[in-house]
């Protein structure tokens, strides 16, 4: 039960995180005009990864897309790339994790396959979350650098006669959405990896199980048999540990090849 809950929760958390990463990537408010200690303007400027916007005091808002690829700063391109990679990996991870969910039955998919898929999706979510966090952090660093540069020469002019007030930009809402979303995706990924451990079929030595063959009592000690080799009344292929049948969610965790992720 705990494994299913962990996997399900990991999926939901990752789903919310990836939705947040998509939202942050699409949002226009990555950087917003700094209103503190600045001349009061009748316009409010804000910028996203894809376009810049100006809201006038009347409420009229005008946005212009960045209709160039080569003319954009390399850092902005890098942030775009990181966010898109994060979304793509997250989307693939979601797709994989849907099929890996324990509560969903697809044909006769084995637990080992589900465990592998859970681990794969978990890793994808972790990388997706890291991409988003990295992208947002790179943009934030760029803003901080530009902020102090524009503060240093806030008023530039010729002979002090004609002044040009430089618009300073500070953190926009999208940065916080991105950080939180990246973190959620990361947490979701970790949860999926943890769930994978519980899903993994155990490779262990079982206690002796007696099989009665043609009147002779011969005890076989199968070393490392898979759990699906039961006979007689155990027709539902339940795992046999300690001579008793347990449901898949009650299986004890033993070290397996998926333990050290």
């Amino acid at each position: 039960m705990a494994v299913t809950a962990c996997q399900g929760l990991g999926f939901v958390v990752s789903l919310i995180g990836i939705a947040g990463i998509i939202a942050a990537t699409c949002m226009d408010q990555w950087s917003t005009q700094d209103l503190y200690n600045n001349p009061v303007t009748a316009v409010f400027n804000y910028q996203g990864l894809w376009r810049s916007c100006v809201r006038e005091s009347s409420g009229f808002t005008e946005c212009r897309g960045y209709f160039t690829l080569l003319g954009l700063p390399a850092m902005l391109q890098a942030v775009r790339a990181l966010m898109i990679v994060g979304i793509v990996l997250g989307a693939i991870g979601l797709l994989v994790s849907i099929f890996a969910l324990k509560c969903i039955r697809i044909g006769s998919m084995e637990d080992s396959a589900k465990a592998n898929m859970t681990l794969t999706s978990g890793i994808m979510f972790i990388v997706s979350g890291l991409c988003a966090i990295a992208g947002v952090s790179v943009f934030a660093n760029m803003l901080v650098t530009n902020f102090w540069m524009s503060t240093a020469n806030m008023y530039t002019g010729m002979g002090g006669m004609v002044q040009t007030v430089q618009t300073r930009y500070t953190f926009g809402a999208a940065l916080f959405v991105g950080w939180v979303a990246g973190g959620l995706t990361l947490i979701g990924g970790v949860m999926m990896c943890i769930a994978c451990r519980g899903l993994a079929p155990e490779e262990t030595n079982y206690k002796a199980v007696s099989y009665h063959a043609s009147g002779h009592s011969v005890a076989y000690k199968p070393g490392g048999f898979k759990a699906s080799t039961g006979f007689g009344s155990n027709t539902k292929n339940k795992k046999i540990y300690d001579g008793g049948a347990r449901t898949e969610d009650e299986v004890q965790s033993y070290p397996s090849k998926h333990d050290y992720v």
Partner: antibody
């Protein structure tokens, strides 16, 4: 037709108070920010205050800050300018003007004005 | 506050003449966010309220004849009347629409010669 009509002007003694009104018609009043602009006799135009459409933002010129209060009643399509501690330099024609929606913050329609005289 | 300086203070012209008046601001009225200039021109005839002529430095307001042209960017702006008509005799004000307080120039009075 867009119309703005100021009222409430008159003669007042220095230190006195006066409340100007601006009645709007011909447009959705609650969709626009409104300005008050004054013009002293034979002088240029002086912007004195602005109120956003929802009253969330109000700006004042330094010359009137603390003495004048701008407000609006969107239900009655009316704008107000409460003037206190009036001085002789407040003598002017007071206009209310609509902040245009897509006119780069310019004032696209003006009222005919109401005259305020501050004199002892 | 932004200081708006208009020149000349008055102009005497004959009907049909081309007229140019200037407006300079103490700070740039070009908004970096959208690369638009926030300057307006108003026409005020005697005994009347001002009327919006040009906004955004160069866009004519609705109903304004095309003989009125606004130009300039940053701190230097110009209003040109290609062929002055009798009804154009008025005071022309320029206004900063980017920074509060929104400031006006002292005006340029257009008179008939």
């Amino acid at each position: 037709e867009v119309q703005l009509m100021e009222s409430g002007g008159g003669l007042v003694k220095p230190g006195g108070s006066l409340k100007l009104s601006c009645a709007a018609s011909g447009f959705t009043f609650s969709d626009y920010g409104i300005h008050w602009v004054r013009q002293a006799p034979e002088m240029g135009l002086e912007w004195i205050a602005y109120i956003s459409r929802g009253s969330s933002t109000i700006y004042y010129a330094d010359t009137v800050k603390g003495r004048f209060t701008m407000s609006r009643d969107n239900a009655k399509n009316t704008l107000f300018l409460q003037m206190t501690s009036l001085r002789s330099e407040d003598t002017a024609m007071y206009y209310c003007a609509r902040g245009g929606y897509d006119t780069r913050n310019a004032m696209d329609y003006w009222g005919q004005g109401t005259s305020v005289t501050v004199s002892s | 506050d932004i200081v708006m300086t208009q020149s000349p203070s008055s102009l005497s012209v004959s009907a049909g003449e081309k007229v140019t008046m200037s407006c300079k601001s103490s700070q740039s009225l070009l908004n970096s966010g959208n690369q638009k200039n926030y300057l307006a021109w108003y026409q005020q005839k005697p005994g009347q309220p001002p009327k919006l002529l040009i906004y955004g430095a160069s866009t004519r307001a609705s109903g304004v004849p095309d003989r009125f042209t606004g130009s300039g960017s940053g701190t230097d702006f110009t209003l040109t009347i290609s062929s002055v008509q009798a009804e154009d005799l008025a005071i022309y004000h320029c206004q900063n629409d980017l920074y509060y307080p929104l400031t006006f120039g002292a005006g340029t009075k257009l008179e008939l010669k």
